[in-house]
């Protein structure tokens, strides 16, 4: 099923969203820190 319909599951999507959210938080934090240091 490597090329089938089951390659885009909700559980996989949720994990991707969690990673995106985490990265956005980390990058946002770094950006705020950079602005603060200026």
């Amino acid at each position: 099923h490597s090329d089938g319909i089951f390659t885009d599951s909700y559980s996989r999507y949720r994990k991707q969203m969690a990673v995106k959210k985490y990265l956005a938080a980390v990058l946002g934090k770094r950006y705020k820190q950079r602005v603060k240091n200026k």
């Epitope: 089938g4 319909i5 089951f6 885009d8 909700y10």
Partner: antibody, heavy 115, light 109 residues
């Protein structure tokens, strides 16, 4: 924001053709499994078919060669080409994301086949 | 063709009732790819449960799913006013096809 917006529905004569569009935002259609699902007035949901990341398409037996699913990666848009339309194709057509389970849905677009 | 049989087709219930809807498939679903949806008139379906028993994000805990193979159940432990709607099951199959149940309308008794 993750969103799907269908367009292209309307009134079409029996035997005619129509192409529906589904514009995605918040994710890329080329890496997702995208589907078309329809619902005739007062009836249940019916899966039409799917397109997977590789571009391979899968269809319900009821689609019987009259319906074609495609996508334009540059426009992040999914399409449903419908040919030789019949009165029984009158329905709200939804696009939805997910493989075997539909976790993001558009608002739907109504297609009416009538003379 | 694969048949997804949902029962009952209509269910009359009161607020606070425990409600159970069943979905039977003529063929075993692939890797428990059985999902449930709620639909209100004029609206798109809402994703409730995935892989038979997992609650989608934001779905109240009064909803639960169970089952495997060919027999599945959706339960609402205590029916709320917002829950009066039509519910559909959908199964994913190894042939890369999807089938929907006929729907169950939950109406006010």
């Amino acid at each position: 924001e993750v969103q799907l917006v269908e367009s292209g529905g309307g009134l079409v004569q029996p035997g005619g053709s129509l192409r529906l569009s589904c514009a995605a935002s918040g994710f890329t259609v080329s890496s997702a499994v995208m589907n078309w699902v329809r619902q005739a007035p007062g009836k249940g949901l019916e899966w039409i078919g799917s397109i997977v990341a590789s571009g391979t398409t899968y269809y319900a037996s009821s689609a019987n060669g009259r319906f074609t699913i495609s996508r334009d990666n540059s426009k992040n848009t999914l399409y449903l080409q419908m040919n030789s339309l019949r009165a029984e194709d009158t329905a709200v057509y939804y696009c939805a994301r997910g493989g075997g389970e539909f976790f993001i849905w558009g608002q739907g677009t109504l297609v009416t086949v009538s003379s | 063709d694969i048949q997804m049989t949902q029962s009952p087709s209509t269910l009359s219930a009161s607020v606070g009732d425990r409600v159970t809807i069943t979905c039977q498939s003529s063929e075993s679903v692939y890797s428990n790819y059985l999902s449930w949806y709620q639909q209100k008139p004029g609206k798109a379906p809402k994703f409730l449960i995935y892989q038979a028993s997992n609650l989608a994000s934001g779905v109240p805990s009064r909803f639960s799913g169970s089952g495997s193979g060919t027999e599945f159940t959706l339960t609402i432990s205590s029916l709320q006013p917002d829950d009066f709607a039509t519910y559909y099951c959908a199964g994913g199959y190894s042939e890369n096809i999807v089938g929907f149940g006929g729907g169950t309308k939950v109406e006010i008794k």
